[in-house]
Interface confidence: low
């Protein structure tokens, strides 16, 4: 496990190979979660920001950028899209949360909440995932598509097994997140595959 505070993964080129596997011991299904991270890219085409697949289940949990101003969240292969007015290109801090009991999904961009959406009420996100940054999985840990690959920088990634209250979302945005128990940038277990470089975070 590595403390990546003040660092980012740089994905320098479009590819079908370059990615980072995030390793977690998630042993029970998720009925709530919050995921936060920072990203910086000048891509205008669609791309995957966070891809979580389980055995035999594609798009179990995906954060996907459709186009400038449109972010999508997939839970169990269902999708909702969030709209935001944003500068391009510009660094962004993204938090997304989902609560199974209500189905409510929340998206926060740079500490500001977007209009809430609903999907997959009562569903449980399966455990034992393959989590990939830099590519969109179409199978369990593989089947990548160059046209959906991420080119840019990702850092400060945290994932909790709960829906964080607004003040904790803001803490994450401000760089002081509460401890995260699924993925924690300060104690991250990861595996770099291909051309991905760790560099200092210089754009926050």
């Amino acid at each position: 496990h590595t403390d990546l505070s003040g660092k980012v993964f740089v994905f320098p080129r479009e590819s079908v190979t370059d990615h980072v596997n995030l390793i977690t011991q998630l042993e029970k299904p998720l009925q709530n979660f919050t995921l936060c991270f920072r990203a910086y890219t000048d891509l205008s085409r669609p791309y995957s920001l966070f891809s979580y697949n389980t055995q035999g289940k594609d798009n179990e949990l995906v954060v996907y950028k459709e186009r400038v101003g449109d972010y999508s969240l997939y839970i169990g292969r269902q999708k909702v899209t969030f709209k935001v007015i944003e500068k391009f290109p510009a660094p962004v801090h993204i938090c997304v949360s989902w609560e199974s009991s209500s189905g409510i999904a929340e998206f926060w961009i740079n500490g500001t909440p977007l209009v809430k959406k609903g999907l997959r009420q009562g569903y449980s996100v399966e455990a034992h995932p393959k989590i990939v940054l830099g590519q969109e999985q179409d199978s369990y840990g593989g089947k990548f598509d160059k046209s959906q690959s991420f080119v840019g920088e990702i850092g400060d990634l945290y994932m909790w097994n709960s829906v964080l209250p607004p003040e904790e979302i803001l803490s994450a945005y401000q760089g002081t997140p509460v401890p995260a128990n699924i993925l924690d940038w300060r104690a991250l277990n990861y595996e770099i595959k291909g051309y991905v470089i760790i560099k200092p975070l210089v754009w926050v």
Partner: antibody
Framework: QVQLVQSGAEVKKPGSSVKVSCKAS????????MHWVRQAPGQGLEWIGM????????NYNEKFKSRATLTVDKSTSTAYMELSSLRSEDTAVYYC????????????WGQGTLVTVSS | DIQMTQSPSSLSASVGDRVTITCKAS??????VAWYQQKPGKAPKALIY???YRYSGVPSRFSGSGSGTDFTLTISSLQPEDFATYYC?????????FGQGTKLEIK
């Protein structure tokens, strides 16, 4: 096996400093957060702070921020906790504890170091 | 800081008894609670993490439950070696905080 071995008991004067060591063995020292917790005689447990040996990133309990300093020596797999401006209420057993590699709890503890502050 | 209030502060019980210790957090801590056992002159030992998961090697008579603000440690059938002090700990927010402890004594 995984072990944390702490330095021996200390008797200190009020106003002085103490530095407690914690030597890790049986695991990769630089991969786990190290925490420090204290326990006054007959009292409960109090979290002081934590340090990641790889980056030397720290996080302190606000109560101790001005007086506690956490450091590591990677070459000897040893963590240190220094507490300055000691007062009688700092008399306690000081523990180092390793954070589990996934969940935020302490899975391995040192045996404790008794620090007595007395004039 | 989040306060963790344990009850009772002390408890007398007999071998074979079922014992329940509760811990109440002053605000939501999700399932980020651990339980430790401490014997006199010794360091604490992890029993339960993430509210309900037993640490490796911990006997099955120990179980944990709860989420949000209310948590419980249950010992289904007390054994002689279980007489000790038990602490809950929240690890949801900095600073991490502990309950004041529950001393379990032989009746």
């Amino acid at each position: 096996q995984v072990q944390l071995v702490q330095s021996g008991a200390e008797v200190k004067k009020p106003g002085s400093s103490v530095k407690v060591s914690c030597k890790a063995s049986g695991y990769t020292f630089t991969s786990y957060w190290m925490h420090w917790v204290r326990q006054a005689p007959g009292q409960g447990l109090e979290w002081i702070g934590m340090i990641h040996p790889n980056s030397v990133n720290t996080n302190y309990n606000e109560k101790f921020k001005s007086r506690a300093t956490l450091t590591v020596d990677k070459s000897t797999s040893t963590a240190y906790m220094e507490l300055s401006s000691l007062r009688s209420e700092d008399t306690a057993v000081y523990y180092c504890a390793r954070r589990n590699d996934y969940y935020w709890y302490f899975d391995v503890w040192g045996q404790g170091t008794l620090v007595t502050v007395s004039s | 800081d989040i306060q963790m209030t344990q009850s009772p502060s002390s408890l007398s019980a007999s071998v074979g008894d079922r014992v329940t210790i509760t811990c109440k957090a002053s605000q939501n801590v999700n399932s980020n609670v651990a339980w430790y056992q401490q014997k006199p002159g010794k360091a604490p030992k992890a029993l339960i993490y993430s509210a309900s998961y037993r640490y490796s090697g911990v006997p099955s008579r120990f179980s944990g439950s709860g989420s949000g603000t209310d948590f419980t440690l249950t010992i289904s059938s007390l054994q002689p070696e279980d007489f000790a002090t038990y602490y809950c700990q929240q690890c949801n927010n900095y600073p991490f905080t502990f309950g004041q402890g529950t001393k379990l004594e032989i009746k």
